[in-house]
């Protein structure tokens, strides 16, 4: 069951999944100047079995003036630091992100790629938050967001983050040891 | 403080069409969805539909489809549920629910008894 | 649709006693379970939410567990204004209810 909406906007935060889960689909989008190629995929699409989950479909580009198809290309690390997921700077991904059974790890990038990624998440799917570049996290709570389904209707959690402007950048878990996420009930939802 | 407040009962003939409100106050009504379930007399519950206070999006139980709907005016925090076609097993306590921050119905409106009878 | 069977229909008590009752879901909610309390001539008051949250202002003697499709509301110290009618609820597909448990003197 994918998720009707996006997951909720917080000020001066980012979001991002360590993994994603099975049923995840991810737009094959291309940078300006280039588009799918003809009889292309238009998004892939994470499957798997009880063991193993992987990336169906591959996402290819070729120039707008030209007829002829690109081949995949895993670009250099300098120029994967320069992608983005869904509303966000895709920082380096934790080791251990591809060990969730169920889930897919970051695809990796595709040749004349959109400089932002669109993905279209599954209920189930959770996404952390941190803030960005000289903004300090207050925390109320977890942040972190998770696509619920509840009366037959999809929405987000709402995460409990704060970001103030002071120079001091909280950390997406894996990054660095995670905090404890307090159990409860959330103060708000963001419904969908 | 949160209040569901109702309009009164009401004895309705078969085929005819029925419609209750429910009046919110105490709390911010676009924030919150807001059900309709029914208790026919010595029955359990029976959730109808819901519809998105803020937005206007709604859904119902397969049942009611096609006889139910589910409307609201934010400007005077009431949402409205009518029932057409009106047969005699929806003989029923009709409540509206709030539904909360934990997604069950924290606060109910107090019924509205419908009778369908020749 | 998911079915909800609630179980026993009736269970005689007395004041002090534990009090157990059951519902099964016939596929898997998620922990999307509600518990309320039902008087006649009243609309029905939460006092469960998600499978084992204790709804603000409810006395600590009900509490909720799951285990798998199993749901459980117990009272752990029966009390005068407990003899009602408790119904489940599941909320993670279209809402669908139990069919409730009369809590009646013994």
């Known amino acids: 069951e994918l998720c009707d909406d996006d997951p909720p906007e917080i000020p001066h935060a980012t979001f991002k999944a360590m993994a994603y889960k099975e049923g995840t689909m991810l737009n094959c989008e291309c940078k300006r100047g280039f588009r799918r190629i003809k009889s292309g995929s238009l998004y892939m699409l994470c499957t798997g079995n009880s063991s193993h989950s992987s990336w169906d479909n591959q996402c290819q580009c070729t120039s707008s003036a030209t007829r002829n198809t690109t081949k995949q290309v895993t670009p250099q690390p300098e120029e994967q630091k320069e992608r983005k997921t869904t509303e966000m700077q895709s920082p380096m991904q934790p080791v251990d992100q591809a060990s969730l059974p169920g889930h897919c790890r970051e695809p990796p990038p595709w040749e004349n790629e959109a400089t932002e990624r669109i993905y279209h998440f599954v209920v189930g799917q959770m996404v952390y938050y941190q803030c960005v570049q000289g903004y300090r996290a207050l925390h109320r709570g977890p942040a972190e967001s998770v696509c619920k389904m509840t009366h037959g209707k999809t929405r987000w959690t709402q995460p409990q983050l704060i970001c103030t402007g002071e120079m001091e950048t909280s950390q997406f878990p894996g990054e660095e040891k995670p905090q404890a996420s307090p159990e409860g009930r959330p103060e708000s939802e963001t419904s969908c | 403080q949160v209040q569901l407040v109702q309009s009164g009962a009401e004895v309705k003939k078969p085929g005819a069409s029925l419609k209750v409100s429910c009046k919110a106050s105490g709390y911010t009504f676009t924030g919150y969805y807001m059900h309709w379930v029914r208790q026919a007399p010595g029955q359990g519950l029976e959730w109808m539909g819901w519809?998105?206070?803020?937005?206007?999006?709604?859904r119902y139980a397969q049942k009611f489809q096609g006889r139910v709907t589910v409307t609201r005016d934010t400007s005077i925090s009431t949402a409205y549920m009518e029932l057409s076609r009106l047969r005699s097993d929806d003989t029923a306590v009709y409540y509206c629910?709030?539904?909360?921050?934990?997604?069950?119905?924290?606060?109910w409106g107090q019924g509205t008894m419908v009778i369908v009878s020749s | 649709d998911i079915q909800m069977t609630q179980s026993p229909s009736t269970l005689s008590a007395s004041v002090g006693d534990r009090v157990t009752i059951t519902c099964r879901a016939s596929q898997s909610i998620s922990s999307w379970l509600a518990w309320y309390q039902q008087k006649p001539g009243k609309a029905p008051k939460l006092l469960i939410y998600k499978a084992s949250s204790l709804e603000s202002g409810v006395p600590s003697r009900f509490s909720g567990s799951e285990s798998g499709t199993e749901f459980t509301l117990t009272i752990s110290s029966l009390q005068p204004d407990d003899f009602a009618t408790y119904y489940c609820?599941?909320?993670?597909?279209?809402?669908?209810f139990g069919q409730g448990t009369k809590v009646e003197i013994k």
């Open positions: 629910a709030r539904e909360g921050a934990g997604d069950a119905f924290d606060f």
């Open positions: 609820q599941q909320y993670n597909s279209y809402s669908t």
């Open positions: 519809i998105n206070s803020n937005s206007g999006d709604k």
